[in-house]
Interface confidence: low
């Protein structure tokens, strides 16, 4: 079976004009997934990103996340790229609200 992830991109403000953007994938199966941040379409180096472990979420599916820190005002330059079981999607940083996108089955 394949259950595509729900992808949820959020922002949290930190000091000195920086924000942390977090891309969360949840409720997916199987557990193999790729999440990475891109700036202007180019994947960020791994040392500028932080990943969470892929963990069971209690419903027979899995969840994980990737985060990076960016300059406030540059949100539109960043997207979260997801690959899962042959599906892929690009998810932008929301403007003022949480954006939830369901990947196509």
């Amino acid at each position: 079976r394949t259950v595509p992830p729900m992808v949820n991109v959020t922002c949290s403000e930190v000091s000195e004009g920086n924000i942390t953007v977090t891309c969360r994938a949840s409720s997916f199966y199987p557990r193999n997934i790729t999440l990475t941040w891109r700036q202007d379409g180019v994947s960020l180096s791994h040392n500028t990103q932080q990943w969470g472990d892929v963990l069971p979420d209690g419903n027979g599916t899995y969840q994980t996340w990737v985060a990076t820190r960016i300059r406030q005002g540059e949100e539109q330059r960043f997207t979260c790229y997801m690959e899962h079981s042959g599906n892929h999607g690009t998810h932008p940083v929301p403007s003022g609200k949480v954006l939830v996108l369901q990947s196509q089955r």
């Epitope: 994947s43 791994h46 790229y81 690959e83 042959g86």
Partner: antibody
Framework: QVQLQESGPGLVKPSETLSLTCTVS????????GHWIRQPPGKGLEWIGM???????DYNAAFISRVTISVDTSKNQFSLKLSSVTAADTAVYYC?????????????WGQGTLVTVSS | EIVLTQSPGTLSLSPGERATLSCTAS???????LHWYQQKPGQAPRLLIY???NLISGIPDRFSGSGSGTDFTLTISRLEPEDFAVYYC?????????FGQGTKLEIK
């Protein structure tokens, strides 16, 4: 059965462009990304770059001014172009598949093709 | 760039013995992005272990991997004749995504 096969000229003249194609079978390039790696004779492995399933590319900065990786999903092929070659670019060139969830590891490889740069 | 240094450069052992191959990174590498490959003469490399310790399907369980930070190890618990080859570690933690120089495992 997953297979990758490199093809292209075995001899390239200095200052010209090296062009190689990787033809894949047993999977689709719409669902798996691809890497190019090279190995000079008697030496170790060097990562050149990769292409993602949506066509975006990541390159080794050492090659970025002269490398292009592209994909033709209708032919199940992805390609490498390396311009302004010198003798230092003589190597066996491999294409490889980016495994799902293997954190960018290369889970299947072509057998490699030797490219010699010489006049 | 992250430099991966493998040691020893050559390891001479007999079938049945235990092999321990080391890979040291010049700066810290996430264990998720450290992989091991085997290459035999005239052949392409093949993936053995991904993310430090995860064995690829079809690879015998005499192979195992461990480590974290800057120090990683590939262990072959009991060498078989077909295990004599060159082994490479590889990091995809930071671009450029480098390989170690290889350890040649040869028959003593």
């Amino acid at each position: 059965q997953v297979q990758l096969q490199e093809s292209g000229p075995g001899l390239v003249k200095p200052s010209e462009t090296l062009s190689l194609t990787c033809t894949v079978s047993g999977f689709s390039l719409t669902t798996y990304g691809g890497h190019w790696i090279r190995q000079p004779p008697g030496k170790g492995l060097e990562w050149i770059g990769m292409i993602w399933t949506d066509g975006w590319t990541d390159y080794n900065a050492a090659f970025i001014s002269r490398v292009t990786i592209s994909v033709d999903t209708s032919k199940n092929q992805f390609s490498l172009k390396l311009s302004s070659v010198t003798a230092a670019d003589t190597a066996v060139y491999y294409c490889a598949r980016k495994g799902h969830g293997y954190y960018y590891a290369m889970d299947y490889w072509g057998q490699g093709t030797l490219v010699t740069v010489s006049s | 760039e992250i430099v991966l240094t493998q040691s020893p450069g050559t390891l001479s052992l007999s079938p049945g013995e235990r092999a321990t191959l080391s890979c040291t990174a010049s700066s810290s590498v996430s264990s998720s992005y450290l992989h091991w490959y085997q290459q035999k003469p005239g052949q392409a490399p093949r993936l053995l272990i991904y993310s430090t310790s995860n064995l690829i399907s079809g690879i015998p369980d005499r192979f195992s991997g461990s480590g974290s930070g800057t120090d990683f190890t590939l262990t072959i618990s009991r060498l078989e004749p077909e295990d004599f080859a060159v082994y490479y570690c590889h990091q995809y933690h930071r671009s450029p995504f480098t390989f170690g120089q290889g350890t040649k495992l040869e028959i003593k």
